[in-house]
């Protein structure tokens, strides 16, 4: 899996999505996680609702959310308040059983908030992401979901 | 701000059926879940099912399975129930209720008195 | 299906007082509980989502905690507009339920 970095502003809220293919994960619940270590285990974060017809509403974990739009196949995780703490590598993942796969590999990045006028020494800045061989940077906004964007799975 | 309007006061001869409507104003229609309670007379809440309107299909309570539809209508932004084969045990308020992005119940409609009688 | 049982049936207090509220599952409903406020001839409203966040426009007075089974809602200083009758709803297991709710009158 190549990783895929999302960079945030401190303060701020952060948006992370993973594109699935809605058919070949149908029917699963999945999950943001956090990996401990290269070779560690990925800690649970976050998961989407129990009920999978009800993957569409939010869940929160802290200051963290889950959504997913399991029509469109589109997990979406928000990290509101974002500290440098928050940096890292993560996961989104699909569950089947007590298996996960792997849907993205997420490095967040956080970036001291230009208008902080502290001394921004202590705060964590996220090395160049060339030192990911394969990682894609993506400059997500951040911004609140917009009423007509919260997603929905079909029913039976 | 979500606003649901429901459709006026039924009253109902057993045996017979009752549609109940909820306008919904505010935000994107297709984008929310509608869900239906019940509350007989002095009774507690209810649900009796929901739909994705932009799945068209919809969920709903076992006990209620085969004796409710619940349809939606985009283009009208409106939300239906329709219950049959009634009887005196129906008579109650049937609320709307959408999801905002929290719980499938986060906004209601006012209610709407269903009495059947003989 | 998951049983929500709400004690009391009623509680009586005065305004100023702390009220709280239980709702009980018979199997675990994990944090997947809400509580509603409904007041006579109106339609419910949200209070708490997840057992324990405030949704918007509530109150800090309001709280909610528990998980599994057991859930508590309190009210750290009834207000006048506080008497109504309070239900927990569970969406964890199909069908959804509500409990049959705890009537806070005054005293």
């Known amino acids: 899996h190549n990783t895929t970095v999302f960079q945030g502003v401190a303060g701020q809220s952060l948006q992370v999505s993973c594109p699935y293919d809605s058919m070949k994960h149908w029917g699963r619940r999945k999950a943001w996680c956090r990996q401990l270590g290269e070779k560690g285990p990925c800690q649970r974060v976050v998961s989407t609702h129990n009920l999978w017809l009800l993957s569409f509403l939010r869940r929160w974990n802290g200051s963290t959310a889950i959504t997913d739009d399991t029509l469109g196949g589109t997990l979406t995780i928000t990290l509101r308040n974002l500290q440098p703490h928050d940096a890292g590598l993560y996961q989104c993942q699909s569950l089947h059983g007590s298996e996960a796969d792997t849907l993205r590999k997420v490095l967040v990045e956080v970036l001291a908030d230009p208008l902080d006028h502290r001394d921004a020494g202590d705060l964590w800045f996220p090395g160049e992401s060339e030192s990911f061989e394969d990682a894609h940077v993506e400059h997500s906004i951040s911004r609140s979901l917009l009423e007509g964007e919260i997603p929905f799975p079909p029913t039976s | 701000q979500v606003q649901l309007v429901q459709s006026g006061a039924e009253v109902k001869k057993p045996g017979s059926s009752v549609k109940v409507s909820c306008k919904a104003s505010?935000?994107?229609?297709?984008?929310?879940?509608i869900s239906w309670v019940r509350q007989a007379p002095g009774q507690g809440l209810e649900w009796m099912g929901g739909?994705?309107?932009?799945?068209?299909?919809?969920n709903y309570a076992q006990k209620f399975q085969g004796r409710v539809t619940i349809t939606a209508d985009e283009s009208t932004s409106t939300a239906y129930m329709e219950l049959s084969s009634l009887r005196s045990e129906d008579t109650a308020v049937y609320y709307c209720a959408r999801t905002q992005e929290y719980t499938l119940f986060d906004s209601w409609g006012q209610g709407t008195l269903v009495t059947v009688s003989s | 299906e998951i049983v929500l049982t709400q004690s009391p049936a009623t509680l009586s207090l005065s305004p100023g007082e702390r009220a709280t509220l239980s709702c009980r599952a018979s199997?675990?409903?994990?944090?997947?509980l809400a509580w509603f406020q409904q007041k006579p001839g109106q339609a419910p409203r949200l209070l708490i989502y997840d057992a324990s966040n405030r949704a918007t426009g509530i109150p800090a007075r309001f709280s909610g905690s528990g998980s599994g089974t057991d859930f508590t809602l309190t009210i750290s200083s009834l207000e006048p507009e506080d008497f109504a009758v309070y239900y927990c709803?569970?969406?964890?297991?199909?069908?959804?339920?509500f409990g049959g709710g705890t009537k806070v009158e005054i005293k």
């Open positions: 739909i994705i309107p932009i799945s068209g299909t919809a």
């Open positions: 505010g935000g994107t229609f297709s984008s929310y879940a």
């Open positions: 199997q675990s409903v994990s944090s997947y």
């Open positions: 709803q569970q969406d964890y297991h199909w069908p959804i339920t």
